[in-house]
């Protein structure tokens, strides 16, 4: 072992007699790095890539195999090799992957499988980016695949990137796929979901659209309130504040149905807090929940502010801020 050549000498070393690899098999795991470099033909490796994944090469041996492929394909690996990279994929840098042209969903799946159970790495992100750009849009099959491996994938895209998602792809989205989406992303996804589910009947439609409602405008919430949907508080709390504010007490009551009692527990949190401050006290009293608004209130103690709702809203909002 002491006579092992230095890395710089590796390419100059000749393969020892009788060690030339005729095929990629298990015997190669006992080859030292310089022996792999000298005795394994890169073209043989490329044609038998499918075998590499079944052989327990060490990390250091995988480095040598990658180096051989890099020399054989300096402009980037062909898809026939990429599809069979297996664990060698984990050795690739984003720079390596940017040279690839991956068009097959099967290739994408094979590589995602290697990284399964781990966070999305820069390599995987680059691979997906290359694949989606190559396809021109995020079609349903691709989205199906990506969200199966990475439930949070959709929420990692910018609003601009999401705009390339066709409405038909929305059918592949599960509620958990939207857990980490912010309002800007839901603003883009909601109209697509509305379009995708438009032919469904009321109750089925609500089940599908529910997780996208963080992007819904006021008029759509008003329409939903007429359909006995019984929205839960968790969904209500994710609605856009600007979409909730114009809703009347009667509309919110219809929208939430039996869940309306949950407003009391959320009265200090947006959007409930801001909505309460916009309502007449008389209207809020009809809910029987003890919610304290600021406008048109016969219970209200700040008479001097009663008709100046703007100032009053500010005052009450500050009062609640201080309490939190």
């Amino acid at each position: 072992d002491a006579a092992q050549p230095a890395a710089s000498e590796v390419e100059k070393t000749a393969c020892p007699s009788g060690k030339k690899a005729r095929e990629i098999d298990e015997s190669l795991i006992f080859y030292k790095k310089w022996e792999l470099e000298a005795c394994v033909d890169a073209a043989l490796l490329a044609t038998q890539m499918d075998r590499v994944n079944a052989i327990p090469f060490t990390y250091e041996q995988l480095d040598v195999l990658k180096h051989k492929l890099d020399e054989l394909y300096p402009q980037g690996y062909p898809e026939s090799v990429i599809q069979h990279l297996g664990y060698l994929f984990l050795k690739m840098s984003p720079e390596d992957i940017r040279k690839w042209n991956v068009t097959s969903l099967e290739t994408l799946k094979a590589l995602l499988e290697v990284n399964k159970g781990h966070e999305m790495s820069p390599q995987v992100a680059t691979l997906i980016d290359r694949f989606v750009k190559g396809r021109g849009q995020l079609d349903k099959d691709t989205l199906d695949t990506l969200t199966a491996f990475y439930p949070g994938y959709l929420c990692s895209l910018s609003p601009e990137e999401l705009s390339s998602v066709p409405p038909s792809s929305i059918w592949a989205v599960r509620p958990q796929d939207l857990d980490t989406c912010d309002p800007r992303q839901l603003d883009v996804l909601y109209p697509k979901a509305r379009l995708a589910f438009q032919n469904m009947n009321g109750s089925e439609y609500f089940v599908k659209i529910q997780s996208f409602l963080g992007g819904a405008p006021t008029e759509d919430l008003k329409a939903l309130s007429q359909q006995n949907v019984s929205m839960d508080l968790a969904t209500f709390m994710k609605l856009r504040t600007d979409a909730v504010l114009p809703l009347t007490v009667a509309e919110v009551q219809k929208l939430l149905g039996p869940h309306v009692e949950g407003l009391k527990a959320e009265e200090r949190h947006r959007p409930v807090r801001d909505w309460i401050l916009r309502q007449r006290q008389d209207d809020l009293d009809t809910l029987g929940l003890g919610l304290q608004g600021t406008r048109g209130s016969h219970h209200h103690h700040h008479h001097e502010f009663r008709h100046d709702s703007g100032l009053n809203d500010i005052f009450e909002a500050q009062k609640i801020e201080w309490h939190e």
């Epitope: 060490t58 250091e60 984990l90």
Partner: antibody, heavy 120, light 107 residues
């Protein structure tokens, strides 16, 4: 939870063979390599070889080449290690040990061990 | 084959002590080293992999360091449960090899 359960202790005569089993549970059997490591009484650990449960391919340490055979049965998630032409110095505790496919080389779970005694 | 030499072979220490065990490789193994703890009559248990990564469920008083040919396992404050034999193991190249072990005993 991950478990590797090995067969009971064995007493063998020199020249005989022994076959030790290791039944895996609590994980996807074909997603991890399985190794065999032995430990003679009061001694250190010695790696014997590796099997890929997915395809059944094997690699053995040179010291055991020709005497050891590792096999697997995917239907029962069990791997086997057979050592032939036993001699007294083969008396040891034999362990199966799992390693992640992606790193191959360290062992995150071990069987409880099987004592093989070779004595005339 | 890559030889691993552990030192000391036996170490006497008391509860609460900070102890360090060393493992030297006969050639560079980068960071491809694991540490195990073994108690009498039991299978080894993985403590550290990739020289310094703590295995899930292992107390944080255990830590590993080093790369190339010199590695150490440190136990920051010995607990009664820590008295055992410790082995290092390289997985840089085949055959996989282990150090001779360090027996940690109560002083």
């Amino acid at each position: 939870q991950v478990q590797l359960v090995q067969s009971w202790a064995e007493v063998k005569k020199p020249g005989a063979s022994v076959k030790v089993s290791c039944k895996a549970s609590g994980y996807t059997f074909t997603s991890y390599y399985m190794h065999w490591v032995r430990q003679a009484p009061g001694q250190g650990l010695e790696w014997m070889g590796i099997i890929n449960p997915s395809g059944g391919s094997t690699s053995y340490a040179q010291k055991f080449q020709g005497r050891v055979t590792m096999t697997r049965d995917t239907s029962t998630s069990t791997v086997y290690m057979e050592l032939s032409n036993l001699r007294s110095e083969d008396t040891a505790v034999y362990y199966c040990a799992r390693s992640p496919r992606v790193t191959t080389g360290y062992f995150d779970y071990w069987g409880q061990g099987t004592l093989v005694t070779v004595s005339s | 084959d890559i030889q691993l030499t552990q030192s000391p072979s036996t170490l006497s220490a008391s509860v609460g002590d900070r102890v360090t065990i060393t493992c030297r490789a006969s050639q560079s193994i980068s960071s491809w080293l694991a540490w195990y703890q073994q108690k009498p009559g039991k299978a080894p248990k993985l403590l550290i992999y990739k020289a310094s990564s703590l295995e899930s469920g292992v107390p944080s008083r255990f830590s590993g360091s080093g790369s190339g040919t010199e590695f150490t396992l440190t136990i920051s404050s010995l607990q009664p449960d820590d008295f055992a034999t410790y082995y290092c193991q390289q997985y840089s190249s085949y055959p996989l090899t282990f150090g001779g072990g360090t027996r940690l005993e109560i002083k």
